[in-house]
């Protein structure tokens, strides 16, 4: 069997000879050199060599426990002659003993940390950590203690944890923002002879809202023309705040003054300025000067600093309205007028009115924008604004006429304004009703009397207020002795009915029926339309089989015997 214990070796050996480790020995070894000891595993043949005859192991190089604390090797004892193992291959351990040869090393060369300004004493800032590569299980070589070398009286460090805390009350960022703290970590529990390392901690005080906004001046004055539309910026005011970020954000508001309803203030988020803008239309003729009280306040306030005073400030803003020559103003935004379609030329439709809003009250003249009335259907009295027709109208051609009227200051033609006129043409009964389509029908030779052969529909271009009411009748010249009758259905339709039993296409192949259509409006309008009726041979179901085509070439008019 093998005869050895665990081997121990001190790290960082500095002797000139190889460092003796120990001896591998089998109780089968007779000491006659017949056995060969072989070493394999971690570092065998390189770090560790064995005398193959004696089993003595030596370390050839300086070993560092921190690089590798344990080496696992395998031992064989073999008969030199046969190669036969006299023992089973066995594993053994060489354990490297620690010396204090490593200083504590911080996880970072430089730490960066932040802590709010005005923090209470003892507020946590950051924890620094140093590690010592030496053996923590043996002695104090890896027992680290922290101390502060630079950064007092502002900060302190907990010796065992490396936690850095604030040590001074009311540290003000606006006074000093950056601190450089140097921390030492020393092993051997901080005792004499311990090894040490240092790190730098760059600490930045972060801002808290401990400063109010302040206007640099108490009064501001701006001018704006009365023509400025709502939303127009008039001027900028700016309060300053010693804080930064959201703590320096400022909201502006108008709190008082006769311009409270006429102006707005909006906050420019980028520049933190208050922009005074026009809210409602200004009128120099009504009011020439406005005074506003504008307040600048922090939207985010920390209650614990309210004792320092209100986190707002106010300033007076004086706004002078400047006079502007303004164009005429129409009495309405748009005009809607009506006229009958049978109106004579020069008929007055209505009138428009415009006034110069300026104090001067300059007189105005009126004109029609000819781009909107190319056919010159309408005209205007340049002095009083009366609109009249200059051509005849037809509702059935155009129901609405949309034109533009221009009002121009006589003394300053550059000042003009425009207004839309919507003219509705009212209906007059000036169109007769007529057939909705061309009617061509047929009657079977064997038709019975009072048989409906066609329904008639009419159309009328007019648009009477109470709707269309058409009446239908045979023309007087065809009414007596007709072979067909017209039945008015009283619903704006009529039917053509047979008046006798049977028709002979060889006697009369085509009938032309003149039908009178009248409307019910004033004055009554009527027209006569002709219906062509062909006599056809039909099957017993009444389906047409054959007809003469002569009717198609007969001249329009009354056929004999219709």
């Amino acid at each position: 069997s093998w005869m050895w214990n665990q081997f121990f070796l001190l790290e960082e050996y500095t002797g000139s000879d190889y460092q003796y480790v120990g001896k591998l020995h089998s109780d089968q070894d007779r000491g006659d050199g017949s056995l060969k000891y072989i070493l394999s595993g971690d570092g065998a043949g390189d770090l560790f060599i064995i005398n193959e005859n004696t089993g003595d192991i030596q370390a050839t190089k300086r070993l560092d426990r921190e690089e590798k604390p344990v080496y696992i090797l395998r031992a064989q004892a073999i008969n030199r002659r046969t190669g036969r193992p006299v023992e089973p291959e066995s594993e053994f351990i060489i354990k490297i003993h620690d010396i204090n040869d490593n200083e504590p090393i911080f996880t970072k060369e430089v730490y960066t940390a932040t802590v709010p300004e005005m923090s209470d004493v003892g507020t946590f800032v950051v924890q620094v950590t140093a590690t010592d590569a030496d053996d923590p299980t043996y002695g104090n070589s890896a027992k680290v203690v922290y101390s502060i070398l630079q950064g007092q009286p502002y900060f302190s460090v907990e010796s065992e944890t490396g936690i850095i805390k604030t040590a001074l009350l009311n540290m003000d960022r606006e006074n000093r923002e950056q601190y450089q703290v140097v921390i030492q970590a020393k092993d051997m529990g901080g005792q004499m002879g311990g090894l040490s390392g240092t790190t730098t901690v760059n600490i930045t005080l972060t801002d808290v809202n401990d400063n109010p906004p302040r206007f640099p001046q108490s009064t501001y004055q701006f001018k704006t023309p009365e023509s400025s539309p709502p939303g127009t910026p008039i001027g900028r005011i700016k309060a300053s705040d010693a804080d930064v970020g959201e703590n320096a954000e400022i909201e502006y508001s108008i709190t008082d003054g006769e311009g409270l309803d006429m102006f707005d203030v909006i906050t420019d988020q980028e520049t933190q300025e208050g922009i005074i803008t026009v809210k409602k239309l200004l009128d120099f003729e009504k009011k020439k000067v406005y005074t506003l009280k504008v307040e600048a306040s922090n939207p985010y306030v920390e209650p614990r600093f309210l004792y320092l005073g209100p986190f707002k400030d106010s300033a007076t803003v004086r706004i002078v309205v400047e006079d502007v020559d303004e164009p005429p103003v129409f009495s309405k935004l748009a005009y809607i007028l009506q006229i009958r379609e049978d109106a004579q030329i020069n008929t007055t439709i209505g009138s428009v009115t415009a006034q110069d809003p300026d104090a001067a009250r300059n007189p105005v003249k009126y004109s029609v924008d000819r781009h909107t009335d190319m056919d010159r259907i309408f005209n205007i009295d340049s002095g009083n604004g009366s609109i009249f027709t200059s051509k005849l109208l037809d509702r059935e051609t155009l129901l609405w006429h949309n034109i533009t009227v221009i009002a121009t200051e006589i003394n300053n033609p550059k000042q003009s304004s425009r207004v839309p006129l919507y003219i509705k043409v009212l209906d007059v009964n000036d169109n007769a009703p007529e057939f909705a389509e061309f009617y061509e029908t047929f009657v079977c030779e064997k038709a019975k009397a009072d048989q409906l052969i066609q329904t008639l529909h009419a159309v009328d271009k007019d648009d009477p207020y109470s709707g269309h009411q058409f009446s239908f009748s045979l023309a007087p010249e065809a009414a007596s002795g007709s072979n067909f009758t017209i039945q008015d259905n009283k619903d704006n339709t009529a039917g053509i009915l047979t008046r006798k039993n049977g028709y002979n296409r060889h006697e009369m192949s085509t009938y032309l029926l003149p039908v009178v259509i009248s409307d019910n409006d004033y004055p009554v309008q009527s027209s006569t339309g002709t219906v062509t009726v062909r006599v056809c041979a039909c099957d017993h179901h009444g389906n047409m089989q054959s007809c003469h085509a002569e009717a198609l070439i007969h001249p329009t008019g009354l056929s004999t015997g219709a």
Epitope: D32, G33, S34, K36, I78, N79, R80, R81, T82, G83, R84, P85, E87, P88, E89
Partner: antibody, heavy 117, light 111 residues
Amino acid sequence: EVQLVQSGAEVKKPGSSVKVSCKASGYTFSNYWMHWVRQAPGQGLEWMGDIDPSHSETHYTQKFKDRVTITVDKSTSTAYMELSSLRSEDTAVYYCARGDLGRFDYWGQGTTVTVSS
Amino acid sequence: DIVMTQSPDSLAVSLGERATINCRASESVSIHGTHLMHWYQQKSGQPPKLLIYAASNLESGVPDRFSGSGSETDFTLTISSLQAEDVAVYYCQQSFEDPWTFGGGTKVEIK
């Protein structure tokens, strides 16, 4: 470079003896066993015996125990194999070979011994 | 004595093909995980040359197309891709106990 150089070919009469030499170089002679192996014409290899040069300890196969003697001269790093009472079936090539952990890692070039009347 | 039996006696293999030689010992030649079986190559007119020791270890300078495996009584020498220069007689040998014995040899030729 390890080398094993053997003596030259021998022709012997039946009943006589032959002594073959093997000179070693390129390694520490006394650290390795020296073996002798023979090979009859067209036949396989046959281990005869070996010697530990440091202690002159020998091992022989039973077949040759009475006829073979293996010796060394440490001063010249030479091993010898003497075979007596030769007969015709001893005609063979005789090899010396260095032994290391049961294997023959270096061989001599071989010495042909012919036994003929 | 431990008797070593090699098979086959001869073997013809195409160039680039695998050649496998077996060796069986009459009793186990393994102890404590060490297999005391070695393989040699002998070319015509030359002394033998060590190829594989302790069943599976390649001797320094031997091409890696040669490999050995096995334990106890059954062992194998494999040439993964036969080359022209591999034509030879191959022997197995045990050093487990005296007398040390060789197999009868296997002759490898090109098909």
